[in-house]
């Protein structure tokens, strides 16, 4: 049937992790997550 790829983010660059539905770029040190990204390898909204 085909299935989920191995559980790691296939995104260019560092600091991507799965948050919610998608692999997202994490927030910089000293910031916190307001909302996760809405597309693969996208940017989270950070505050």
């Amino acid at each position: 049937q085909g299935g989920t790829r191995s559980p790691r983010c296939d995104c260019a660059g560092d600091f991507h992790k799965k948050i919610g539905l998608f692999c997202c770029r994490g927030c910089p040190a000293g910031h916190y997550l307001k909302a996760p990204c809405t597309e693969p390898c996208g940017n989270s909204t950070c505050l």
């Epitope: 790829r5 692999c23 909302a35 693969p40």
Partner: antibody, heavy 123, light 107 residues
């Protein structure tokens, strides 16, 4: 066997509120992502809301953001959609569906759907 | 937002015919394309995901193909049970979007 049974649909006045429920069985509810999809009177399908499996992040299109809230109760195996400030354009059949993660953190398909519950917004 | 377009809203065919339903995306969707069948009673079922992979339990007369922005669903030999409306959907960036549907009828 996966089963999804929606309820709570009704006739409501513009500006009113309504809470839909989706009772789920046949799978590990807490680890599955779930969505609400609606079908408008002209038969178009529109994504309405999603809650991710495990970490329970929520997502909405701009058309319902700030008015609709998706939530779940793992103890009751039930998904909810709280709808407020309802408009005539929210009139639709509302379906809940499970989302299957095809590729990790990338791509999903809606692999099981309920039978739907009808919402009519009219004065 | 990615727009999904099914140019044919209704299609009439005879039992046993080979039927193809098309879907176009407003941008490249990397084969992240799903097909759903909605029966006249409103029941919705996933048929195909990732352009061409058959969902468990779906008859092998259904197949999917395409790439980039253009995709299609084919029924190799139409059966009475296939009378339904078929929707395509892109399942990657939000908002997830659907085509307008193609209603399949018997000639």
């Amino acid at each position: 066997e996966v089963q999804l049974v929606e309820s709570g649909g009704d006739l409501v006045m513009p500006g009113g509120s309504l809470k839909l429920s989706c009772a789920a069985s046949g799978f590990i509810f807490s680890s599955y992502g779930l969505s609400w999809i609606r079908q408008t009177p002209d038969k178009r399908l529109e994504w309405v809301a999603t809650i991710s499996g495990g970490d329970s992040y929520t997502y909405y299109p701009d058309s319902v953001k700030g008015r609709f809230t998706i939530s779940s109760d793992n103890a009751k195996n039930t998904l909810y959609l709280q709808m407020t400030s309802l408009k005539s354009e929210d009139t639709a059949m509302y379906y809940c569906a499970t989302q299957r993660e095809i590729y990790y953190g990338t791509y999903y398909a809606l692999d099981h759907w309920g039978q739907g519950t009808s919402v009519t917004v009219s004065s | 937002d990615i727009q999904m377009t099914q140019t044919t809203s209704s299609l009439s065919a005879s039992l046993g015919d080979r039927v193809t339903i098309s879907c176009r995306a407003s941008q490249d969707i990397n084969n992240y394309l799903n097909w759903y069948q909605q029966k006249p009673d409103g029941t919705v079922k996933l048929l195909i995901y990732y352009t061409s992979r058959l969902q468990s339990g779906v008859p092998s007369r259904f197949s999917g193909s395409g790439s980039g922005t253009d995709y299609s669903l084919t029924i190799s030999s139409l059966e009475q049970d296939d009378i339904a409306t078929y929707f395509c959907q892109q399942g990657s960036p939000l908002p997830w979007t659907f085509g307008g549907g193609t209603k399949l009828e018997i000639k």
